[in-house]
């Protein structure tokens, strides 16, 4: 058993049929010695008396808020949560496996630049009685500071018969140099509590590996005289690291109709303009990627050919 | 003061070209190592990230873009000093900081070159003959060093009398390639920045 926060404790249980469970001793936080009784949650049934209560925790029915009282007055609370371990593996029931970039990916993180600011998000089908707490650091043995905000519900989607909820959190490394060469990864730890179930999820990454620039901005077209060719120009996104001659981007320019199966014109360039062939009912799209370290491409920025 | 992209400073351009070749060569070599050594811990997640130049050179600090010198977090240690000549510099551009930066890059390349050559000598003794260093990568390191053209004492190639542990050597190769790729990215950024300045 260990303390998650004040008056909230996590009991780690091997979860299998007829498992013996864990013996837990609760101590009432009071100077009083006599006349103390214990109850669980909203029940008025007295579970025991005395300053300490010894319980065998085997299942969710044994978890919950234990309260010690004296003469009708509440002295203190202890909330017990369960953390299940099945076949040596901690349960991951609360969050959905996003399977990208690989299986067992519960947390996904992205950074728009090298400033040390990043966003992580996760998915769940659970809508109520759910809380998250996020901690982060650079390295684990001698951790350096990363400050994370509160996790918030950022999107709701309908997937078949189920509703899916996306939560996200923003974090900022306390003293980040955009030009630094990372040797210790960022560690992100998410504590998830659903009713009386506790789970924790972790992710470890270098900022350079989670870079995904914003789309290029200010796309403009200029038709070339006596030609089907069009010059398309754009600018670096505002959120990208500066100076741009140091933090350079490379671009992919594509002309395509509405369907992905349609024919297309595609060209890669390090410049902020390109010449392509425009077709009726097609769109010109441009996306960006770090020129020197190939992490993710940005989303497309698009303008219609016409 | 925008220089036209089509006419880069001839003094810096050869170094930019060589640094691009360097990044390409080390990335290809790393990819090859990851594929060939698939049953060894050779991915970024599996290896320890070591920097053999740590406390010996200060490339990131010495080559910091002016715009980032206002950032306190970027100014850990800018006290290392180096020799101040180099053929990548057009004389009108020569400044102490730039010479310091290019000299630091040269020292990095020299250290990695020695490590890679020592390692290759060991890998050539491996009866499995599983992996060797790409001669192109070694040649590209050499070309960039020549383009930088700094005078410095030659570092003797390390020779080891004991029987090499090929497993450890291959893991060390992965560690070295990952670190060198990160440094090659920095070098490329620096050359691009200097070329545009």
């Amino acid at each position: 058993i260990w303390e998650l926060k004040k008056d909230v404790y996590v009991v780690e249980l091997d979860w299998y049929p007829d498992a013996p469970g864990e013996m837990v001793v609760l101590t009432c936080d009071t100077p009083e010695e006599d006349g103390i009784t214990w109850t669980l949650d909203q029940s008025s049934e007295v579970l025991g008396s005395g300053k300490t209560l010894t319980i065998q925790v085997k299942e969710f029915g044994d978890a919950g808020q234990y309260t010690c009282h004296k003469g009708g007055e509440v002295l203190s609370h202890s909330l017990l949560l369960l953390h299940k371990k099945e076949d040596g593996i901690w349960s991951t029931d609360i969050l959905k496996d996003q399977k990208e970039p690989k299986n067992k990916t519960f947390l996904r993180c992205e950074a728009k630049n090298y400033s040390g600011r990043f966003t992580c998000w996760w998915l769940t089908t659970i809508s109520t009685d759910l809380t998250f707490s996020v901690k982060s650091s650079r390295g684990s043995s001698d951790p350096q500071g990363v400050t994370c905000g509160a996790a918030t519900l950022s999107a709701e989607r309908v997937r078949g018969d189920n509703k899916e909820y996306e939560y996200s959190v923003e974090c900022q490394e306390d003293s980040a140099c955009p030009a630094a060469e990372e040797s210790l990864p960022i560690e992100v730890m998410v504590d998830a509590v659903h009713k009386l179930k506790y789970e924790n999820y972790t992710s470890s990454f270098f900022i350079r590996d989670i870079i995904k620039p914003d789309p290029p901005k200010n796309l403009q077209l200029k038709p070339l005289k006596n030609s089907r060719q069009v010059e398309v120009s754009w600018e670096y996104p505002d959120t990208w690291s500066t100076p741009h001659s140091y933090f350079s981007l490379t671009f992919c320019v594509q002309v395509q109709g509405k369907s992905k199966r349609e024919k297309k014109d595609r060209v890669f360039t390090d410049k902020t303009s390109a010449t392509v062939i425009c077709r009726k009912n097609a769109s010109i799209s441009v996306r960006a990627q770090d020129r020197y370290y190939s992490s993710s491409w940005s989303e497309w920025a698009s303008v219609p050919c016409s | 003061r925008n220089l036209p992209v089509a006419t880069p400073d001839p003094g810096m351009f050869p170094c930019l070209h060589h640094s691009q070749n360097l990044l390409r060569a080390v990335s290809n070599m790393l990819q090859k190592a990851r594929q060939t050594l698939e049953f060894y811990p050779c991915t970024s997640e599996e290896i320890d990230h070591e920097d053999i130049t740590k406390d010996k050179t200060s490339t990131v600090e010495a080559c910091l873009p002016l715009e980032l010198t206002k950032n306190e977090s970027c100014l850990n240690s800018r006290e290392t000093s180096f020799i101040t000549n180099g053929s990548c510099l057009a004389s009108r551009k020569t400044s102490f900081m730039m010479a310091l930066c290019l000299s630091s890059i040269y020292e990095d390349l020299k250290m990695y070159q020695v490590e890679f050559k020592t390692m290759n000598a060991k890998l050539l003794m491996d009866p499995k003959r599983q992996i060797f260093l790409d001669q192109n990568m070694l040649a590209v390191i050499d070309e960039l060093m020549q383009a930088l053209n700094f005078n410095s004492e030659t570092v003797p190639q390390k020779s080891s009398l004991e029987e090499p542990d090929f497993y450890k050597t291959k893991i060390k190769l992965c560690i070295l390639l990952h670190a060198f790729r990160i440094r090659a990215v920095t070098i490329d950024r620096v050359m691009s920045y200097l070329n545009a300045s």
């Epitope: 199966r261 349609e262 024919k263 297309k264 014109d265 595609r266 890669f268 390090d270 062939i277 | -």
Partner: antibody, heavy 118, light 107 residues
Framework: QVQLVQSGAEVKKPGSSVKVSCKAS????????LHWSRQAPGQGLEWMGW????????EYAPKFQGRVTITADESTSTAYMELSSLRSEDTAVYYC???????????WGQGTLVTVSS | DIVMTQSPLSLPVTPGEPASISCRAS??????LHWYQQKPGQAPRQLIA???QSISGVPSRFSGSGSGTDFTLTISSLQPEDFATYYC?????????FGQGTKVEIK
């Protein structure tokens, strides 16, 4: 299985024209760009131009501009390349090629030898 | 027009050995570079798209690298069926242009 089948070899007199056909099978004809390139005996490849069969848009290499015409007939899934004012240096194997991507080629025809000789 | 220069023009290789062909562009073309193989009396066949993207159906011993002006096609271990002429082609701008070709011959 996508295939491009070209017309047979031709022998032409200098100053005349030649029209080579390229019939596509497998896949929708208008879903692809169609290109023509040529290869003189013992020489490398030389790109001549492309057509978008969907709308008839064409683009030609400046070297062939005014002398080459590329057309397409959607009803028969056939593209044509006509080269006029032939000279002996036009002797080459002419290839059609196609792709959903405009600027390179994933499927090629078998080639048509055009010999220009007096 | 962008001029593509291949080297060497002829490359004698022992079967089973690796081979590398270089292609250089007269100006920077990013990764807009494609590789083809052509055997005598046959049409070219696509090997690599955009400098390094492999094509389905092409053996994994063929790989491409490079960007900007310098590109390489590598065959990790030459098989008897790989003896052919190889062409690079730029798609950075029209007109599309090819290299002169590199003939890989049996040593």
């Amino acid at each position: 299985q996508v295939q491009l089948v070209q017309s047979g070899a031709e022998v032409k007199k200098p100053g005349s024209s030649v029209k080579v056909s390229c019939k596509a099978s497998g896949g929708t004809f208008s879903d692809y760009y169609l290109h023509w390139s040529r290869q003189a005996p013992g020489q490398g490849l030389e790109w001549m131009g492309w057509i978008d069969p969907e709308n008839g848009d064409t683009e030609y290499a400046p070297k062939f501009q005014g002398r080459v015409t590329i057309t397409a007939d959607e009803s028969t899934s056939t593209a044509y390349m006509e080269l006029s004012s032939l000279r002996s240096e036009d002797t080459a194997v002419y290839y059609c090629a196609r792709n959903k991507e405009l600027r390179y080629f994933d499927v090629w025809g078998q080639g048509t030898l055009v010999t220009v000789s007096s | 027009d962008i001029v593509m220069t291949q080297s060497p023009l002829s490359l004698p290789v022992t079967p089973g050995e690796p081979a590398s062909i270089s292609c250089r562009a007269s100006q920077s073309i990013s990764i807009n570079l494609h590789w083809y193989q052509q055997k005598p009396g046959q049409a070219p066949r696509q090997l690599i798209a955009f400098a390094s993207q492999s094509i389905s159906g092409v053996p994994s011993r063929f790989s491409g690298s490079g960007s900007g002006t310098d590109f390489t096609l590598t065959i990790s271990s030459l098989q008897p069926e790989d003896f052919a002429t190889y062409y690079c082609q730029q798609s950075n701008s029209f007109p599309l242009t090819f290299g002169q070709g590199t003939k890989v011959e049996i040593k």
